[in-house]
Structure formats: C-alpha cells, structure tokens
C-alpha cells in the first residue's frame, strides 16, 4: 500500500510552537490564542526503516508544501535542513535516509532520532526565536523533547 | 485475557463536567496506544480521542477540540477522558478501546460506559 | 474528512446463506480499512484489518476484500452468532470515520 500521512503539529517540552522563518528554516516561540495558527503543519508519513515498539520511523514533510526536513552534513557536522523535493515522488515508502527520523517515546515525550546520524536529534534551544536544529546531546541545555498534536486533514 | 472495563458515565446538564475511566488489565498498557469511542444513540460510531502510549501524542476531532481532553496513568493501568462544557450532543455510549501503535484500527474495546447530557 | 457509505443499511438473511455487506469511501483509501461487529449490547469486536486480514480468533468464514474505494465483507455461510451490526472504519487520514453501520437479522 501506499505510504500513509497524518497531519500533527509539535511542540517542545518547554510549549514553544514551531514556525516558519524564512523559506528554508524553523524556528521555536511561545504562541497563545490566535497566534497559533501561525505554527508549522507536519505531514508526517510513516516509512520503511528499522522499527520496534517505542521508535517508529516517520518523515516530516511541511503540510501542502514540497519542503521535508532532511540531516545532511556541513562542513563536517550533522544539519537539520528544509529541503524541496519533487511533489510527484514524494512522500514515498523508501524514503532516503537523510529524510528519515526515528520518532521515540519516552514516557510523556517525544524524540525524533536521526536515522542518517544515530544520536542526533531534532532540538531547540531554551531562548525564544531561535532556529530547530539538529543537536547531538540529550539532557542538556538544549530542547529534544516534544508532544505532538494530531490534527483532522 | 484482554479487559477495558469503563466508568465514570451518568446524567449531566448541559454546560457540565464528567470524568471517564478505563481500568485495563490482561496486557501491558504502557505499550499500547490507547482512544475513546463514542455511539450516540441510532448513529455511528465516533473517534473522539487519541492518545500514544506514553501521552506523548494525542488527537481530538474538531467535534470535542478544546472540550475534551485525554490522559493515562501507565502505574494504574488506566486511561481518562474529561469532558467539559458538555452539550445534548454528546450523549452517547463512551467505548475505550486499544489502538495498534501506528494509529490505526482498534483491536480490543470495552463494554462502554452511557454518558447522558440533559437538563 | 472522507465520507463512509455501507450498503445496505440492513438485510435478513438465513442460517447458511452467504451475505456480502458493501462499504464505499468518498477518497481513495488503498487497504487502509476495518470491518467490526457488533451485538447488541455488546462492545464491537475487531472481524478484518487491512481490507482482507482476518483478526486472531476470527472465523474463516468471514472474508475481506476490496481497494481504493470500494470494499466487501462477506460471510461466506451465516451462522446464528452472526446476527450483529456490522461496521467499517477507514484509518487512512484524520479522522479515522466509520460507515453508518449494517444490521444483519434473521429472516
């Protein structure tokens, strides 16, 4: 069967909303009321990948948009980035590595893994306004943990 | 044996608050992803809340958003539904049922538990 | 949302007749479908996953088929447990919707 999407929204633990900055960036900030609607719809598409009860392998496209976030390296150092794809091929079941993330959860929370970089995580920072990222550390100042909102197509 | 035992359900006015329970036993709860499914009387079933098996994830269809709410306590293997500023048209049998962890069809359900909004 | 239609609404039937039951979604669905049954009373039970996979503990005479956007149920020699409602369920998109529902009696 065909690869399968559902629309979500994410949110870190600290309740920053994710939004667009700019045509090829995200950025993490506390919304309320109707400023919400500004926050970044995922369509997120359940891939093939190692799986097992608590890590699911997903890619995160941008809702409508032919934008999915991929890990690739610069100058030597894993880098979340917005990247365009063909909306005729995409979303697919094989997904290329650098489009996939283990989605991992952990109590109440969610982890997005990168399955290009093990150990490497969707992050954002504890300031408010600042870029997501890719972070290779867990428990530290930096943000890898989130909830994640499902909502109607 | 798989068991999703409600409660909680009674009569309520309009504009009032009821809290559901699923006492589940026979698996291991932490693992399951886990939802709520309503019948209102001669209709069709209705998803009404979604949550993962750890409460990181949850959905509510546009009919409950922002009234009702899901959690689970994983120590007591049980799951809740609150439900606010409840209207007729959520008089209904309450089903809590297990999900697959994919979001996809409920493979256990309980027996339900009739919440009754009228004045 | 995608819109569920099962037909009929409700049929009578008799012990060892076979009886297919219709399920029609308003979008493109692929497998991504359910069948449960219901006795009165009684919570639904989960009868086929996938379109065609029959659940654990599901008799063999209960099949499923069908893709995209037209889908069967057929219980291939009705037996006296199987007077029920019937229901399908589409998990491919949010929401995940159910059809109106069949009700099977006894003619």
């Known amino acids: 069967a065909p690869v399968r999407s559902l629309n979500c929204t994410l949110r870190d633990s600290q309740q920053k909303s994710l939004v667009m900055s700019g045509p090829y960036e995200l950025k993490a900030l506390h919304l309320q009321g109707q400023d919400m609607e500004q926050q970044v719809v995922f369509s997120m598409s359940f891939v093939q990948g190692e799986e097992s009860n608590d890590k699911i392998p997903v890619a995160l496209g941008l809702k409508e948009k032919n934008l999915y976030l991929s890990c690739v390296l610069k100058d030597d150092k894993p880098t979340l980035q917005l990247e365009s794809v063909d909306p005729k091929n995409y979303p697919k079941k094989k997904m290329e590595k650098r489009f996939v993330f283990n989605k991992i959860e952990i109590n109440n929370k969610l982890e997005f893994e990168s399955a290009q970089f093990p150990n490497w995580y969707i992050s954002t920072s504890q300031a408010e306004n600042m870029p997501v990222f890719l972070g290779g550390t867990k428990g530290g100042q930096d943000i890898t943990d989130f909830t994640m909102q499902f909502v109607s197509s | 044996e798989v068991q999703l035992v409600e409660s909680g359900g009674g009569l309520v006015q309009p504009g009032g608050s009821l809290r559901l329970s699923c006492a589940a036993s026979?698996?291991?709860?932490?693992?399951?992803?886990m939802s709520w499914v309503r019948q209102a009387p001669g209709k069709r079933l209705e998803w009404v809340a979604y949550?993962?098996?750890?409460?990181?994830?949850?959905y509510f269809p546009d009919t409950v958003k922002g009234r009702f709410t899901i959690s689970r306590d994983n120590a007591k293997n049980t799951l809740y539904l609150q439900m606010n500023s409840l209207r007729a048209e959520d008089t209904a049998m309450y089903y809590c049922?297990?999900?697959?962890?994919?979001?996809?069809?409920?493979?256990?359900w309980g027996q339900g538990t009739l919440v009754t909004v009228s004045s | 949302d995608i819109q569920m239609t099962q037909s009929p609404s409700s049929l009578s039937a008799s012990v060892g007749d076979r009886v297919t039951i219709t399920c029609r979604t308003s979008?493109?669905?692929?497998?991504?479908l359910t069948w449960y049954q219901q006795k009165p009373g009684k919570a639904p039970q989960l009868l086929i996953y996938?379109?065609?996979t029959l659940a654990d503990g599901v008799p063999s005479r209960f099949s499923g088929s069908g893709s995209g956007t037209q889908f069967t149920l057929t219980i291939s020699s009705l037996q006296p447990e199987d007077f029920a409602n019937y229901y399908c369920?589409?998990?491919?998109?949010?929401?995940?919707?159910f059809g109106q529902g069949t009700k099977v009696e006894i003619k």
């Open positions: 026979g698996f291991d709860f932490s693992r399951y992803d």
């Open positions: 979008g493109n669905i692929h497998n991504y």
């Open positions: 369920q589409h998990f491919w998109s949010l929401p995940f919707t």
């Open positions: 049922a297990r999900q697959n962890k994919k979001l996809t069809w409920f493979d256990y």
């Open positions: 949550i993962s098996s750890g409460g990181g994830s949850t």
């Open positions: 996938n379109a065609k």
